[in-house]
Interface confidence: low
């Protein structure tokens, strides 16, 4: 069964319960998640993921017994992993994917939860206990069963059966909004310093909401939302309401690459790089962001608040979700996809939209003429034959169609005349008493990329043109220069002329005009995504990437590009990981993609970068990036104490002991020495990779790094008996680069 | 400055024992975890085990081609380590160093005596 | 055991030259690589821990990367002291163990 986030199951206790056989299976990638609440007026049975560690807290009369696993064992990691509690006889086990993490002996009262089982989600129940717990499940729940009975029938509407495709989803999947109350809610944008939002937009919705942050102080809130088919941007501070509109249209179901910028001075909404900003008033200052931030819809207290307000948004425009999707969703710098959401609601995992669709089932007998390679045009099904009515000139005997189409031909980006070879009649139109401006065409679909340009007064309006237009070299179609080999011009073809001829004429025949695009080899170019400045600490190195620099080339994959270090090759600080010390002169795109490349910065002023890239017949205008190495500071964000039991082990976590650095977009290696003796015990590190079972060996030096992934303990070994605590004072210096922090 | 000065090298036969000190100064010795590294002649380096200190039960890791043969002791009060090898084999010989981490942590060896030669011949 | 093998055994340069020598585990040693230089008859001198820290007192010439299995020792531009044989050492896991050195030549 699937949760997203807000939902819960409710399952009815009559009795008190005296043994207790719980069994879940569950996955998420949330570290917080309520799992299971077996509720009472004071009794109760909880269970919960708190920082990835599964928690359960048991409360029997005046006992309470806690029980969890181990920190270094995460359980939000997607996979599924199965819980079994059992509370038999005065003994309380537990144990994940069959290993026993703990146990205890618990009252032997039986366990009093009238107000029953809430599976997932505590509901609108308001109890004292459950003050902090944690946030609703967003993932799966593959079984739950109590006692042999199944925690998850019935399912509710908001709890879907099978495990949901969005929870696996990576964050290059789209999210996809299915309508009507379509919501994604994830962990609220702040805007301190700066904000921004960016993502690609498809919709066909002309009126929807985007995003929406609520702040802190009452009525504050950031609003993002299409607004008679353009965005909008609307920010309410205390001093006022800044309003900023975009002119790019967005309605047209195409993508549209969307960026929302705000800093203390000003709002900038840019779609397509069509950029629309105020002046720098400087009146937003800083929105302390609450709540989360919303996409694509609105909950409840978020349509209060914009009806509440002088925009005079209407309620049904407030309670209108977005139809569509977005991709590369990216909040302050960060990729975030459907994974990292705090709650869904309507959602699908990809970009589904429903009018595509419809259009796939209209159109789907072209469909092959916009794939297929041009010379292998099929028999044509379009025109439907037509069937003369008998009594008419001969010369419409055997007759089914009025013209023959051959394809037009265009170069990429350039433009070519409608000519009689490409609408040939298919009889004499003299011998069938026809002139050639009496058979009339009318465009009734124009191509997806290129416009059929009409030299005729009026006639570029009605979309209408004839035969003779054509002969005359009156009709041209101009590519708009995309990379698509083919394309289609949907024409209707009538005959205006007062003779006998067969009423399918007079009616109009629908004819398929396959466009064949020839292509031009456009050259590459280099992007700076996040602009042409590179900050790296002093002797550290920097991986360089796609989020540093890009290869943009309409016309070639990325297999197909090569990227060359313009300059000397000595001392040249771009090197492949695997190959460290050796200069890096030339790259390939994928290289860059896979993150294999490294700038090393060895000491001095940093080097800036000049590249070029090629697909083998052109190359780009060289580009440069500068790049300014800046001295490591470092600064202390958590030193707190351990307390652990003599003879014991304490992992040293990120909570007790991590550091600051001022890199900018750099993951830097931050060293910790030991550097005085250990009196009681000794600082332990865990063999590489962390991995279960691998030994645990005295160190004297760790990165962060080994912190974060809980690899480094304190084991106290000292064997004497003390009448009082210890305490051991560890003297740690930081190094980062050359820069050492000493005394910390 | 910190001085390791190393003593007891020499020529034995298989089979026969030999020990190795090494007396530390300039640096607070019981602070130190302290190492025994050998070379044979022409050839690499090789580790042959360290103590730690008092405060970790004087715990003591060994190389297994020395494992049960070789017992490395640290005298605290007299700033000395010391290196005793029993049951000597001909591939023992090699020039032994003493070495120490403490200061500049990680287990690498920041700090080296000279230097003593052992040959086991017969 | 982890076994480093280093590459090449001999390397003949000359004064002014980028020298690069590498070292291989045989099995994820994160970054807990030092480096060393040995010169005929001495002890061994720390260069480099960490993979890439170096020890006070080594001039910047000296530069080591690397992370996992495959670690560098780079020399920007060989200086007439610099010719000696250089080791790698991993301290990851015990038994702690040296690669067989790189002999640098002058040529």
């Known amino acids: 069964a699937s949760f997203f986030g807000e939902n819960h199951l409710e399952v009815p206790v009559a009795t008190a319960l005296t043994d207790i056989d719980l069994q879940l299976q569950f996955s998420t990638s949330q570290p917080e998640a309520l799992l299971l609440l077996a509720a009472g007026p004071a009794d109760h049975l909880l269970l919960q993921l708190y920082s990835g560690r599964l928690q359960v807290r048991l409360v029997l009369g005046q006992e309470e017994l806690r029980l969890q696993t181990p920190a270094e064992t995460l359980l939000s990691d997607s996979i599924p992993h199965t819980v079994v509690l059992t509370v038999v006889e005065g003994w309380a086990t537990l144990s994940v994917d069959g290993f026993l993490n703990a146990s205890s002996a618990v009252p032997g009262a039986p366990l009093e939860v009238p107000y029953g089982l809430f599976v997932g989600g505590t509901g609108t129940l308001g109890l004292p206990y459950l003050r902090g717990t944690s946030r609703p499940l967003r993932g799966c729940l593959h079984a739950a069963t109590l006692n042999g009975r199944s925690l998850l029938r019935p399912l509710t509407p908001d709890v879907h059966e099978g495990c949901a495709e969005e929870f696996s989803a990576s964050d290059d999947v789209a999210l996809g909004f299915s309508g009507p109350h379509s919501l994604a809610a994830f962990p609220a944008w702040g805007t301190q310093d700066e904000g921004t939002l960016e993502f690609t937009l498809t919709t066909q919705s002309r009126q929807a909401p985007l995003a929406f942050q609520a702040g802190g102080r009452r009525g504050d809130f950031i609003y993002v939302d299409i607004f008679e088919g353009h965005l909008r941007a609307v920010v309410e501070k205390g001093q006022g309401t800044v309003l900023l509109h975009n002119s790019v249209p967005v309605a047209d179901g195409q993508p549209h690459e969307v960026s929302v910028h705000i800093n203390a001075h000003r709002l900038e909404i840019s779609v397509d790089q069509y950029p629309t900003h105020t002046s720098n008033r400087g009146v937003l200052s800083y929105l302390e962001p609450r709540g989360s931030l919303l996409l694509g819809g609105l909950d409840a207290e978020a349509s209060r608040h914009l009806q509440e307000h002088r925009l005079g948004l209407t309620p049904e425009a407030t309670n209108a979700s977005l139809l569509g999707c977005m991709e590369d969703l990216s909040v302050n710098g960060q990729r975030r996809g459907l994974r990292e959401a705090l709650l869904t609601r309507n959602m699908a995992a990809g970009c589904r939209l429903e009018e595509e669709e419809y259009e796939d089932d209209a159109y789907g007998h072209y469909e092959a003429f916009s794939t297929l390679a041009p010379e292998a045009w099929p028999a044509m099904e379009l025109p439907e034959p037509c069937v003369p009515e008998p009594g008419l000139p001969p010369v419409f005997a055997n007759f089914t169609q009025l013209l023959t189409i051959s394809p037009l031909v265009v170069a990429e980006g350039g433009t070519a005349w409608l000519e009689w070879r490409h609408v040939q009649p298919t009889l004499d139109l003299m011998e069938a008493e026809l002139r050639k401006s009496q058979v009339l065409f009318s465009v009734t679909r124009g191509a997806r990329h290129g416009e059929l340009e009409l030299d005729i007064p009026g006639a570029q309006a009605r979309k209408m043109f004839t035969l003779l237009d054509v002969v005359n070299r009156k009709a041209r179609f101009i590519h708009d220069g995309s990379e698509d080999t083919s394309d289609q011009l949907v024409l209707e073809v009538s005959v205006t002329a007062r003779v006998p001829m067969p009423s399918c004429l007079r009616r109009g025949q629908t004819y398929l005009l396959p466009i064949q695009v020839n292509p031009v080899n456009d050259p590459p170019h280099i992007i700076f995504p996040h602009g042409s400045l590179m900050v790296i600490l002093e002797h550290t190195q920097k991986p360089l990437g796609p989020e540093v620099f890009q290869a943009y080339d309409p016309d070639s994959a990325c297999e197909g590009l090569t990227f060359q270090v313009l300059g000397t090759s000595s001392g040249l600080p771009v090197e492949r990981r695997d190959q460290p010390g050796e200069p890096a002169t030339e790259f390939s795109c994928r290289e860059l993609e896979a993150g294999s490349l490294v700038y090393v910065h060895r000491g001095g002023p940093a080097q800036d970068l000049t590249f070029r890239v090629s697909d083998g017949l052109q190359a780009s205008p060289p580009a440069t990036l500068k790049v300014v190495a800046i001295r490591p500071a470092i600064q202390i964000h958590r030193s707190t104490g351990l307390r652990l039991a003599q003879g014991s082990a304490m992992p040293i976590l990120p909570a007790n002991l991590s550091v600051e650095t001022n890199a900018v977009g750099q993951d830097v290696s931050v060293l910790f020495r030991v550097t005085g003796a250990l009196q009681f015990g000794e600082l332990q590190k865990q063999g590489a990779g962390g991995v279960e079972g691998a030994e645990w060996w005295a160190t004297q030096a760790f990165h962060q790094r080994d912190v974060e992934q809980g690899r480094v303990r304190y084991l106290s070994t000292d064997p004497q008996h003390h009448a009082y605590d210890t305490v051991e004072n560890l003297a740690l210096e930081v190094q980062v680069g050359q820069e050492i922090l000493s005394n910390l | 400055e910190v001085q390791l000065v190393q003593s007891g090298g020499g020529l034995v036969q298989p089979g026969g024992s030999l020990k190795l000190s090494c007396a530390v100064s300039?640096?607070?010795?019981?602070?130190?975890?302290m190492n025994w590294v050998r070379q044979a002649p022409g050839k690499g380096l090789e580790w042959v085990g360290e103590i730690r200190l008092k405060s970790n039960n004087f715990g003591r890791y060994y190389a297994e081609s020395v494992k049960g043969r070789f017992t490395i002791s640290r005298d605290d009060s007299k700033n000395t380590a010391y290196l005793q090898m029993n049951s000597l084999k001909t591939e023992d010989t090699a020039v032994y160093y003493c070495?120490?981490?403490?200061?500049?942590?990680?287990?690498?060896?920041?700090?080296w005596g000279q230097g003593t030669l052992v040959t086991v011949s017969s | 055991d982890i076994q480093l093998t280093q590459s090449p055994s001999f390397l003949s340069a000359s004064v002014g030259d980028r020298v690069t020598i590498t070292c291989k585990a045989s099995?994820?040693?994160?970054?807990?690589v030092a480096w060393y230089q040995q010169k005929p008859g001495k002890a061994p001198k720390p260069l480099l821990f960490?993979?890439?820290y170096r020890y006070t007192g080594v001039p910047s010439r000296f530069s080591g990367s690397g992370s996992g299995t495959d670690f560098t020792l780079t020399i920007s531009s060989l200086q007439p002291e610099d010719f000696a044989t250089y080791f790698c050492q991993q301290y990851n896991s015990y038994p702690l163990t040296f690669g067989g050195g790189t002999k640098v030549e002058i040529k």
């Open positions: 099995q994820n040693v994160d970054t807990n």
């Open positions: 070495t120490s981490y403490g200061n500049y942590v990680g287990h690498y060896f920041d700090h």
């Open positions: 300039g640096f607070t010795f019981s602070n130190y975890w």
């Open positions: 960490s993979a890439s």
